[in-house]
């Protein structure tokens, strides 16, 4: 799997959407995980609806929720008031049984807000000093990272 | 054992720039932030800011923003620091620490040596 | 930006003697506090994270505890080598500080 980075700025909402093959997970709830360690378990954060027709509703733990479009294939969390501690190494899953497929694996960073200068001095703009060349700026930054472009930490 | 070795200490012009490299060993690169903390003579310490060396990701304190670079080379697992501008209140030791989380913030374990950094004119 | 104080700034201690720093945030930080030990000349030593969890390889003679905005850092037997500026930190929100340091000397 591919890692896709996920930029948001401290105290604003951060939306990590993952796009799913719609057919092929039919039928199956997702989940939203954080990776602990480098060969520790995944975490589970929020899950979808107990009942998969009832996945459009979204779920809630704390901060983060989930929802997903079962239809159009894509789930979608959000972290609300994005703090320094929300940074990590997370997946989102589709769940069969007691088995997880991991449907993407997302790092979150959380950057300190550029709008917040107390002096007018150097306008900083998100990005701008991050190797994100080919970023795709919404709400967040985010970049697909190839496997072989930057080694990953092993987790087995 | 893990451990971050950084360059040796430089004097520099007011107006110049410095860039301080931090090698690190004993672990995963990739999978760790780097913080940059200061030190100026007598007072006590200042962080600078992080690079996630897995994304080259960065963000700094707002002081510093604009006048701070942070940079990665994965393949000989280095961060650097690279301060500009330079003023002779920069004078200080530069320290580079690991973060203990796993591509997270949950406090810094290691540090490296430090590197002194000189502004006089 | 968010203060840290830390208290007392200084304090003369012999060696056996349970000491304790405090550390106080100018806002709720939960528990996303460090202790830091500093010898003259050399770099920090990461003591405890978390406020209380203890480094690998920290004696724990050290122990840390406090959530909110009121932290302790306790030192439960002084010895030698504990003679040193001790700092809090926090790393809740941006940009992470420091406290002031708190010099343990002998007395």
């Known amino acids: 799997h591919n890692t896709t980075v996920f930029q948001g700025v401290e105290g604003q909402s951060l939306q990590v959407s993952c796009p799913y093959d719609s057919m092929k997970h039919w039928g199956r709830r997702k989940a939203w995980c954080r990776q602990l360690g480098e060969k520790g378990p995944c975490q589970r954060v929020v899950s979808t609806h107990n009942l998969w027709l009832l996945s459009f509703l979204r779920r809630r733990n704390g901060s983060t929720a989930i929802t997903d479009d079962t239809l159009g294939g894509t789930l979608t969390i959000t972290l609300r008031n994005l703090q320094p501690h929300d940074a990590g190494f997370y997946q989102c899953q589709s769940l069969h049984g007691s088995e997880a497929d991991t449907l993407r694996k997302v790092l979150v960073e959380v950057l300190a807000d550029p709008l917040d200068h107390r002096d007018a001095g150097d306008l900083w703009v998100p990005g701008e000093s991050e190797s994100f060349e080919d970023a795709h700026v919404e709400h967040s930054i985010s970049r697909s990272l190839l496997e072989g472009e930057i080694p990953f930490p092993p987790t087995s | 054992q893990v451990q971050l070795v950084q360059s040796g200490a430089e004097v520099k012009k007011p107006g110049a720039s410095v860039k301080v490299s931090c090698k690190a060993s004993?672990?995963?690169?990739?999978?760790?932030?780097i913080h940059w903390v200061r030190q100026a003579p007598g007072l006590g310490l200042e962080w600078m800011g992080w690079?996630?060396?897995?994304?080259?990701?960065?963000t700094s304190a707002q002081k510093f923003q604009g006048r701070v670079t942070m940079t990665r080379d994965t393949s000989i697992s280095s961060a650097y620091m690279e301060l500009s501008r330079l003023r002779s209140d920069d004078t200080a030791v530069y320290y580079c620490?690991?973060?203990?989380?796993?591509?997270?913030?949950?406090?810094?374990?290691?540090w490296g040596q430090g590197t002194t950094v000189t502004v006089s004119s | 930006d968010i203060q840290m104080t830390q208290s007392p700034s200084s304090l003369s201690a012999s060696v056996g003697d349970r000491v304790t720093i405090t550390c106080r945030a100018s806002?709720?930080?939960?528990?996303?506090l460090a202790w830091f030990q500093q010898k003259p000349g050399k770099a920090p030593k990461s003591l405890i994270y978390?406020?209380?969890s203890l480094q690998s390889g920290v004696p724990s003679k050290f122990s840390g505890s406090g959530s909110g905005t009121d932290f302790t850092l306790t030192i439960s037997s002084l010895q030698p080598e504990d003679f040193a500026t001790y700092y809090c930190?926090?790393?809740?929100?941006?940009?992470?500080?420091f406290g002031p340091g708190t010099k343990v000397d002998i007395k």
């Open positions: 620490a690991r973060d203990g989380g796993y591509l997270a913030l949950y406090g810094t374990d290691v």
């Open positions: 004993g672990y995963t690169f990739t999978g760790y932030y």
């Open positions: 690079i996630n060396p897995y994304s080259g990701g960065t």
């Open positions: 806002q709720g930080i939960s528990n996303y």
């Open positions: 978390a406020a209380s």
């Open positions: 930190q926090q790393y809740s929100t941006y940009p992470f500080t």
